[in-house]
């Protein structure tokens, strides 16, 4: 026997009190699938959240964050304060990146500058709070008489 509730479309619930007729979801609620016995309460985008998409009878509201904040978590479950480039968010608010670290975004943490010497390269452009260092050619590549551009090897003909 087919469950009569399976005939109830999205946007309705199967009303057990009324011989399982399909009743429209109450205001501020929705059902995104058919055959539901209750509707779900719409998400309310309040405070630092703002409405990106209104709730409808068949889909939940979607929130994003007011200017100066950015979304965190699945479905923008949290809003976190933006900082400036060159800063990171701490428990005490936005703080400048320490020397030797940088952040080129309004969110996230300060990261250490790239250590060019680990790749055998030299620092071409110094790092700042907002920008990573730019690594240049290795010191050996810059020795007198050395070309900084290696010409391509001549192509070999087949059979040689």
């Amino acid at each position: 026997l087919q469950d009569p509730c399976s005939n109830c479309p999205a946007g309705t619930f199967c009303d057990n009190n009324r011989n399982q007729i399909c009743s429209p979801c109450p205001p501020n609620s929705f059902s995104s699938a058919g055959g539901q016995r209750t509707c779900d309460i719409c998400r309310q985008c309040k405070g630092v959240f703002r409405t990106r998409k209104e709730c409808s009878s068949t889909s939940n509201a979607e929130c994003d964050c007011t200017p100066g904040f950015h979304c965190l978590g699945a479905g923008c479950s949290m809003c976190e304060q933006d900082c400036k480039q060159g800063q990171e968010l701490t428990k005490k608010g936005c703080k400048d990146c320490c020397f030797g670290t940088f952040n080129d975004q309004k969110r996230g943490i300060c990261r250490p500058w790239t250590n060019c010497s680990l790749d055998g390269k030299s620092v071409l452009v110094n790092g700042t709070k907002e920008r990573d260092v730019v690594c240049g050619p290795s010191p050996a590549d810059l020795s007198p008489g050395a070309s900084s551009v290696t010409p391509p090897a001549p192509a070999r003909e087949p059979g040689h």
Epitope: S29, C39, I41
Partner: nanobody
């Protein structure tokens, strides 16, 4: 026992007005989310208007915005629907309804009254 008794319906000409009343007993209107649903001949139920968030906000269906006004009198435990600029398509049985929030997070509603018939015709 929860009871909802609607009244105030009748026959009215297009462009006319009516005020529906819903006297509630067995619960306190001001502590609930309540509203009006209607059922036109041969059609399904439709939400018309509601007072939500314990009076913090109101809802109106697009088809009645600017023409219908929902209100309540907490002292009389009565819900009202003032209907003006009535149209033929407003013809329906109007029921007073109480939104029910279930422990698991689901939402349904209950309407216990017999409803009141509104007929808009010339």
């Amino acid at each position: 026992e929860v009871q909802l008794l609607e009244s105030g319906g009748g026959l009215v000409q297009p462009g006319g007005s009516l005020r529906l009343s819903c006297a509630a007993s067995g619960f306190t209107l001001s502590a609930e989310d309540v509203g009006w649903v209607r059922q036109a001949p041969g059609k399904g139920l439709e939400w018309v208007s509601a007072i939500l968030d314990h009076g913090g906000s109101t809802y109106y269906a697009e088809s009645v915005k600017g023409r219908f006004t929902i209100s309540r009198d907490n002292a009389k435990n009565t819900l009202y629907l003032q209907m003006s600029s009535l149209r033929a398509e407003d013809t329906a049985v109007y029921y007073c309804a109480r939104v029910i929030y279930h422990a698991g997070g689901g939402v349904t509603y209950d309407y216990r009254g017999q409803g009141t018939q509104v007929t808009v015709s010339s």
